[in-house]
């Protein structure tokens, strides 16, 4: 029988091994959300194993949504070009590996895994089912592959080869940034505050990435996005440390850990508070 029969119409054995995703959200179906905007975005298609375009409605949806094709590829694909033979270079972990365990505000009781920066190991925790942060993995293996160091202090992917040129920040690359700042935190810290669709008036905090501060807003009780924190401290912990202030064209104010050479830019014009 032909190999096409074995793999249906998706991909053949000779082309690629079965997909090993860098992030579980790459397996989500593209979700345009309930709103009616027409925004060109990209998602990773697990069947074609490629990043593809879709139209996003502007609210809700899921994390398999990227502003650019490049960002999608960096988050969800492992090209051969991104694999190199092990060298003495230490690869840096994605920023979200350093976020604290966050069960979120919902009341599910779901086993997930997070990277504990104190123990330098991936550990089990109970996730509530919504919000939280991206230091949250469906499987122990996925957490280890992304956040733990390999046996020689390397970060390794599923194939045992060192990840190279993976963009460790989660922010859009296609947009403009104030020259004084660089952002390296979770992508949802750049999203506008979103009240959601219900009728409650709960006190919450969102990260305003224009001014680099956490600000209060009224949450409706459902929907919205992940830039939504129950306390100012939680908001600052998740988002504030993503900003690094520049002191000159090439230099950075000293921080706890090295940053990628790749610079990430934030949208100045797209930041606003929705439904306020």
């Amino acid at each position: 029988d032909s190999e096409e029969d074995e793999e249906h119409t998706i991909i053949t054995d000779t082309e690629l091994p079965p997909l090993k995703l860098m992030h579980s959200f790459c397996a989500f179906k593209a979700d345009d959300g309930p709103c009616k905007a027409i925004m060109k975005r990209f998602f990773f298609n697990i069947f074609t194993r490629q990043c593809e375009e879709f139209i996003y409605g502007g609210c809700e949806g899921n994390q398999n949504r990227f502003e650019s094709l490049e960002e999608c590829k960096k988050m969800c694909t492992r090209d051969n070009a991104n694999r190199i033979i092990k060298t003495t270079l230490q690869q840096e972990k994605p920023d979200f590996c350093f976020l604290e365990e966050d069960p979120g505000i919902c009341r599910g009781y779901i086993t997930r895994y997070f990277y504990n920066n104190q123990t330098k190991q991936c550990e089990r925790f109970k996730y509530g089912g919504c919000l939280g942060n991206m230091n949250n993995f469906e499987t122990l293996e996925e957490c280890k592959n992304i956040c733990e160091d390999g046996p020689n202090g390397f970060q390794v992917d599923n194939y045992g080869t060192q990840l190279n040129a993976v963009n460790n920040s989660l922010t859009p690359q296609s947009t403009k940034v104030p020259s004084l700042f660089e952002f390296h935190g979770p992508s949802w810290c750049l999203t506008p505050a979103d009240r959601g669709l219900c009728r409650a008036n709960e006190n919450r905090f969102y990260y305003n990435s224009v001014i680099g501060k956490c600000r209060p807003f009224k949450y409706s009780g459902c929907g919205g996005n992940e830039n939504n924190f129950t306390s100012k401290q939680e908001c600052l912990r998740a988002c504030k440390k993503g900003f690094i202030q520049r002191i000159s064209k090439g230099g950075l104010i000293k921080t706890k850990r090295k940053r990628k050479k790749q610079r990430v830019k934030i949208a100045y014009e797209e930041i606003f508070v929705k439904n306020m």
Epitope: P18, L21, K29, N62, G108
Partner: antibody, heavy 121, light 107 residues
Framework: QVQLVESGGGLVQPGGSLRLSCAAS????????MSWVRQAPGKGLEWVSS????????YYADSVKGRFTISRDNSKNTLYLQMNSLRAEDTAVYYC??????????????WGQGTLVTVSS | DIELTQPPSVSVAPGQTARISCSGD??????VYWYQQKPGQAPVLVIY??NRPSGIPERFSGSNSGNTATLTISGTQAEDEADYYC???????????FGGGTKLTVL
């Protein structure tokens, strides 16, 4: 040609144990997630358990958690389901199914013909 | 938790279009898969999302939006008589869910 052949089914008393096996051929077994899905007589399909290609992660339906254990031996191209503390409601045809890729979020694209497990005193 | 609800039975005349629904909360935001099972046989994947595996006739198609996914069989033939199951993966709880199944009768 992809082939999945289940074995190990049979009659067992409540509280007893059985070990099901699934011999795989016609594809690179070590590169695919695998699952067990069951079907009680005259009823619908129910997912039981999945295991990713490297064996490092396993997933179970609530109805079998703590009683069933899925495992695989990639060197033997074989998938297993160890069933302990069996109950009458575990009576079903048990299907071995290959998932379309490495992860347990892929759909089941090939199925075996099933093996019948009957739990009765 | 996802719950998928299917009608227990659907009848269609030969050559007509059969539509089998699968409803669940916001199911349109998830991948849905359809399996055909004939008596005494193992299930066969006939639709993944809105795609058809090779070897599945063109008369089978799938759509999914809002709270309902639909399997459509255009120009239904006698050989299409079978049980049909929808399925989806719950990425929050990491488990698979099947609908209760629909018996398609070709009159």
């Amino acid at each position: 040609q992809v082939q999945l052949v289940e074995s190990g089914g049979g009659l067992v008393q409540p509280g007893g144990s059985l070990r099901l096996s699934c011999a795989a051929s016609g594809f690179t077994f070590s590169r695919y997630a695998m699952s067990w899905v069951r079907q009680a007589p005259g009823k619908g399909l129910e997912w039981v358990s999945s295991i990713i290609s490297s064996s490092s992660e396993t997933y179970y339906a609530d109805s079998v958690k703590g009683r069933f254990t899925i495992s695989r031996d990639n060197s033997k191209n074989t998938l297993y389901l160890q069933m302990n503390s069996l109950r009458a409601e575990d009576t079903a045809v048990y299907y071995c199914a290959r998932l379309m890729g490495y992860g347990h979020y892929y759909p089941f694209d090939y199925w075996g013909q099933g093996t019948l497990v009957t739990v009765s005193s | 938790d996802i719950e998928l609800t299917q009608p227990p039975s659907v009848s269609v005349a030969p050559g007509q279009t059969a539509r089998i629904s699968c409803s669940g909360d916001k199911i349109g935001s998830k991948y849905v898969y359809w399996y055909q099972q004939k008596p005494g046989q193992a299930p066969v994947l006939v639709i993944y999302d809105s795609n058809r595996p090779s070897g599945i006739p063109e008369r089978f198609s799938g759509s999914n939006s809002g709270n309902t996914a639909t399997l459509t069989i255009s120009g239904t033939q006698a050989e299409d008589e079978a049980d049909y199951y929808c399925a989806s993966y719950d990425s929050i709880y990491s488990y698979w869910v099947f609908g209760g199944g629909t018996k398609l009768t070709v009159l």
